[in-house]
Interface confidence: low
């Protein structure tokens, strides 16, 4: 299976009911503390506002946040860590009416209430210490 380049940036148009699907694998073992970062940007540039920031510190914790007017807001942290060392995973981000729901390998683990309208999201970026095999948006 061919790998997608990382960072992977894609133009998107999201609404309630949209699903972002990512299949990937950590590049290194958890002992070396790899990260995964997924950002839902409001513009097609990396320094734009972020409606949903999802960062996995593999083997440790997950952090979710938003960035508005170049300022990070209140962080939401979870210690739930369903990712397994060295294993491929499927991440699905569901856009619900009131929140983003993040599923790992088919199970819901994380929720993040909307702070910025979903209709503002123009670009999704997936990056950091992963090999990426799939990125898909379904509306």
């Amino acid at each position: 299976m061919s790998l997608l380049s990382v960072p992977h940036t894609e133009s998107v148009s999201l609404s309630t009911g949209s699903t972002v699907t990512i299949e990937a694998r950590p590049l290194v073992c958890f002992f070396n503390e790899p990260h995964l970062q997924v950002d839902f940007h409001t513009e097609m540039k990396e320094d734009s506002d972020i409606a949903f920031h999802f960062q996995v510190y593999f083997g440790n914790r997950v952090v979710m946040n938003s960035r508005e007017y170049r300022t990070w807001k209140e962080e939401v942290e979870s210690k739930n860590m369903p990712f397994q060392d060295g294993q491929e995973f499927e991440l699905r981000i569901l856009v619900l009416e009131d929140k983003y729901q993040v599923m790992v390998n088919g199970q819901a683990y994380y929720n993040f209430n909307h702070r910025i309208p979903v209709s503002s999201v123009k670009m999704v970026q997936v990056w950091r210490d992963i090999s990426l095999t799939k990125f898909n948006v379904s509306n």
């Epitope: 958890f30 002992f31 083997g59 739930n80 860590m81 369903p82 397994q84």
Partner: nanobody
Framework: ELQVVESGGGLVQAGDSLRLSCAVS????????MMWFRQAPGKEREFVAA???????YCANSVKGRCTISRDNAKDTVYLQMNSLKPEDTAVYFC???????????????WGKGTLVTVSS
């Protein structure tokens, strides 16, 4: 294959402390995340505390500040220290092992049979 056996339960007074032990037999103990859950009569099993294979710890809000979880990989044992016990801590305490650091009973790979803790007022 892991075998999980809890011990240390019993009858204690409110305000007392208790240390539960969880002995695990199996060659790969050190690669498992270890969790404690509890189940009070007539209630669902609830997460209490976790310790990752690398040693990171987490206690549920219901026991935060009163809970210490530790592991001794040389002895293949996990410990749960509970301080300032309350009558509502009365439950069967279960030790579990998982390859995923997830605080959900359905995610556990191996379970012990439990040890009863009764806190009297």
């Amino acid at each position: 294959e892991l075998q999980v056996v809890e011990s240390g339960g019993g009858l204690v007074q409110a305000g007392d402390s208790l240390r539960l032990s969880c002995a695990v037999s199996g060659r790969t103990f050190s690669s498992y995340h270890m969790m404690w859950f509890r189940q009070a009569p007539g209630k669902e099993r609830e997460f209490v505390a976790a310790i990752a294979w690398r040693g990171g710890t987490y206690c549920a809000n219901s026991v935060k500040g009163r809970c210490t979880i530790s592991r001794d990989n040389a002895k293949d044992t996990v410990y749960l220290q509970m301080n300032s016990l309350k009558p509502e801590d009365t439950a069967v305490y279960f030790c579990a092992a998982s390859l995923r650091y997830v605080f959900d009973p359905s995610a556990m790979d191996y379970w012990g049979k439990g040890t009863l803790v009764t806190v009297s007022s």
